[in-house]
């Protein structure tokens, strides 16, 4: 049969609120070298146990025998530290260990969740959570809205789930755990109500350097909104915002709009360019969640200058002229040009010469016509810039150069004239 | 000297339930977990739970929660394992094992084999 | 859980010669436990506390090791050495085993 248990005092009980300190002791009387007094929970070695070993000889000699006393100190009380508790020691070749000393917790419910501050939409429903354990158990939980119960009894309402239909004013929410020890309260969390996200943003009409936007507000409560944010931001080849990336890739273009109305005229924008815009709008409590992002394009428009430096040179019948693509912006795709010439005493000649930028004439006649002059515009998709000023041809001087070009005869049907009054760019004439 | 035996080998059909013995001699029954640790064959070991004889409690290993129930009768110093709801990868040698941190005395094992 | 990977899987050597089994845990750990397993047979403790022979192992068994390195030497391979060696811990639940070294004879 086994030895006798070297223990002559065993761990005893410790019950108490979480946080409390307290000592677990356990002592025994060998003969000889005192041996290490290890310490198990639940059957487990406490490897980092705050234990301190005190060794007393109870003689002169070293094989007299020792009094030898571990004590556990438990210096904040939590659930983990709950258990059977025992002192293990090995002597020779012999286990042993004590009898079980006892951690109990038993106080006041202790929160492990608790609402938290959150910001809801108008009208949204949402849900806020709570959950509190003893011992001693049960447990039971009573919701608070604006320090007003939600329930008639602990117990009786929603428990660790509260779920809320939906508000429209910022309000305080907490819960109460009770036991049979007592109540403890919760944090109060504060819910603030902002407006819902505005709706159907949406292009009123496009120029090509402006957009106009509309959208619809949503819901704010008994807040009213003070304004509204639009952002746009110019697309990068679709691809972050596309991705739904929530942040634009570069700073975006940000303008206010007083409401109502809920309108916008947003100015200083590229022409025959892709933005993405966006909205949000704000009350007293905070500013709504933002829309998705809208892509948006403006359109084209017409070249806002007349091409640059024409130069026109005549030799007889013939007439060379060459030009520049307009310094001033195109406000769109280049399409081509379009050519106006014009005699003293002759009907206007229009020629669409597409995108080159010199062209010879063939005149009609032998060249007797007097005061020609050319004038030159460009065009895009959404029409025709402004003409340049009337360039006149130069006879050609023996010793300059004469580039051969593609002859581009004088139309002898009248298809190619347009009448005077459609020429509404060609004052000039 | 510590000694544990167990009962002998189980052939079981898939669904019913088994119930090991291990019977301690040689030291304190109360005073010493015991745990329950399983060889599938060819395989390593998996422990199961322990019981602690003093007071009855158990602590179970999760994946075996709600189909393993540990007993013991200190009259007659022995501890019990049944397991429920036997599958064919229930198969194994089950051991009942001294605990005093670590497992430093074994039974000598109980074949269970679950087949239809 | 915390898992621990024994290597190598398989020790070939022979009577006379040094084995060294490591053992590493997924995890850091304060003790190893070591056991050793023979066919058809329960296991049986070798070291306790990562370094402590258990009673009646001879002195040719050592065990060292901190954090998640530990190791099982033996010092001169005796002819009933060879057998599958496994490590454990309990640092935290559920206590859990190696997958086993087979040390065989070469």
């Known amino acids: 049969q086994a030895e006798e248990s070297p223990f002559v005092g065993n761990p005893g009980n410790i019950t108490g609120a979480r946080g409390l300190t307290g000592t677990l002791r356990c002592q025994l009387q060998v003969q000889g070298e005192p041996p290490e007094v290890h310490w198990l929970r639940d059957g487990q070695i406490l490897e980092l146990a705050d234990s301190t070993q005190t060794q007393v000889p109870l003689g002169e000699d070293e094989q007299d025998d020792w009094i030898v006393v571990s004590q556990l100190r438990i210096t904040s009380l939590q659930l983990s530290d709950t258990g059977q508790y025992q002192c293990l020691v090995f002597l020779g070749h012999q286990t042993f260990v004590s009898q079980p000393g006892y951690v109990g917790l038993e106080g006041l419910p202790y929160f492990l969740e608790e609402p938290e501050d959150r910001t809801v939409a108008a009208n949204t429903p949402f849900n806020l959570s709570c959950q509190a354990q003893g011992p001693p158990e049960p447990v039971d939980l009573l919701w608070l809205q604006d320090a007003v119960p939600l329930a008639t009894a602990p117990g009786h309402g929603p428990q660790r789930s509260l779920h809320v239909p939906g508000l429209n004013k910022t309000s305080s929410f907490s819960c109460e755990a009770h036991n049979a020890k007592g109540v403890t309260t919760s944090r109060t969390a504060t819910i603030t109500v902002l407006p819902q996200q505005p709706r159907n943003l949406h292009l009123v009409s496009r120029q090509p350097t402006e957009l106009e936007v509309a959208w619809t507000p949503g819901l704010s409560g008994i807040y009213p909104l003070t304004h509204c944010t639009l952002q746009a931001v110019l697309s990068d080849d679709g691809m972050g915002i596309q991705a739904g990336e929530p942040d634009p890739p570069e700073e975006p273009l940000t303008s206010q709009a007083s409401v109502p109305p809920h309108q916008l005229r947003l100015g200083s924008l590229h022409p025959h360019t892709p933005y993405h815009i966006r909205v949000a709008c704000t009350s007293s409590q905070g500013p709504s969640s933002w829309t998705h992002w809208l892509p948006v394009e403006t359109p084209e428009g017409v070249p806002l200058g007349p091409p640059e430096n024409i130069s026109a040179t005549r030799n007889g019948s013939q007439a060379f002229v060459h030009w520049q693509e307009p310094r001033a912006p195109l406000q769109g795709t280049l399409l081509g040009y379009r050519l106006a010439y014009q005699g003293q005493d002759t009907p206007e000649v229009l020629m669409d010469i597409g995108l080159r930028q010199e062209v010879t004439l063939e005149l009609q006649g032998d060249g007797s016509v007097s005061n020609l002059t050319v004038c030159v515009a460009a065009y895009t998709a959404a029409g025709d810039g402004p003409w340049s000023l009337p360039v006149p041809l130069e006879a050609w001087r023996p010793g300059q150069a004469q580039p051969v070009h593609q002859l581009v005869k004088e139309p002898s049907t009248p298809a190619f004239s347009w009448p005077h009054h459609h020429h509404h760019h060609h004052h000039h004439h | 000297q510590v000694q544990l035996v167990q009962s002998g080998a189980e052939v079981k059909k898939p669904g019913a339930s088994v119930k090991v013995s291990c019977k301690a001699s040689?030291?304190?029954?109360?005073?010493?977990?015991i745990n329950w640790v399983r060889q599938a064959p060819g395989q390593g070991l998996e422990w199961m739970g322990w019981?602690?004889?003093?007071?009855?409690?158990?602590k179970y290993n999760e994946k075996f929660k709600g189909r393993v129930t540990m007993t013991r009768d200190t009259s007659i110093s022995t501890a019990y394992m049944e397991l429920s709801r036997l599958r064919s990868d229930d198969t194994a040698v089950y051991y009942c094992?001294?605990?005093?941190?670590?497992?430093?005395?074994w039974g000598q094992g109980t074949l269970v084999t679950v087949s239809s | 859980e915390i898992v621990l990977t024994q290597s190598p899987a398989t020790l070939s050597l022979s009577p006379g010669e040094r084995a060294t089994l490591s053992c590493s845990a997924s995890?850091?750990?304060?003790?190893m436990y070591w056991y050793q397993q023979k066919p058809g047979q329960a296991p049986r403790l070798l070291i306790y506390?990562?370094?402590n022979l258990a009673s009646g192992i001879p002195a040719r068994f050592s065990g060292s090791g901190s954090g998640t390195d530990y190791t099982l030497t033996i010092s001169s391979l005796e002819p009933e050495d060879f057998a599958v060696y496994y490590c454990?811990?309990?640092?935290?639940?559920?206590?859990?085993f190696g997958q086993g070294t087979k040390l065989e004879i070469k």
């Open positions: 040689g030291y304190p029954f109360t005073d010493f977990y």
């Open positions: 506390l990562t370094s």
């Open positions: 019981i602690y004889p003093g007071s009855g409690n158990t």
């Open positions: 094992a001294r605990s005093t941190g670590f497992f430093d005395y």
């Open positions: 995890s850091s750990i304060g003790y």
């Open positions: 454990q811990q309990w640092s935290s639940n559920p206590p859990t």
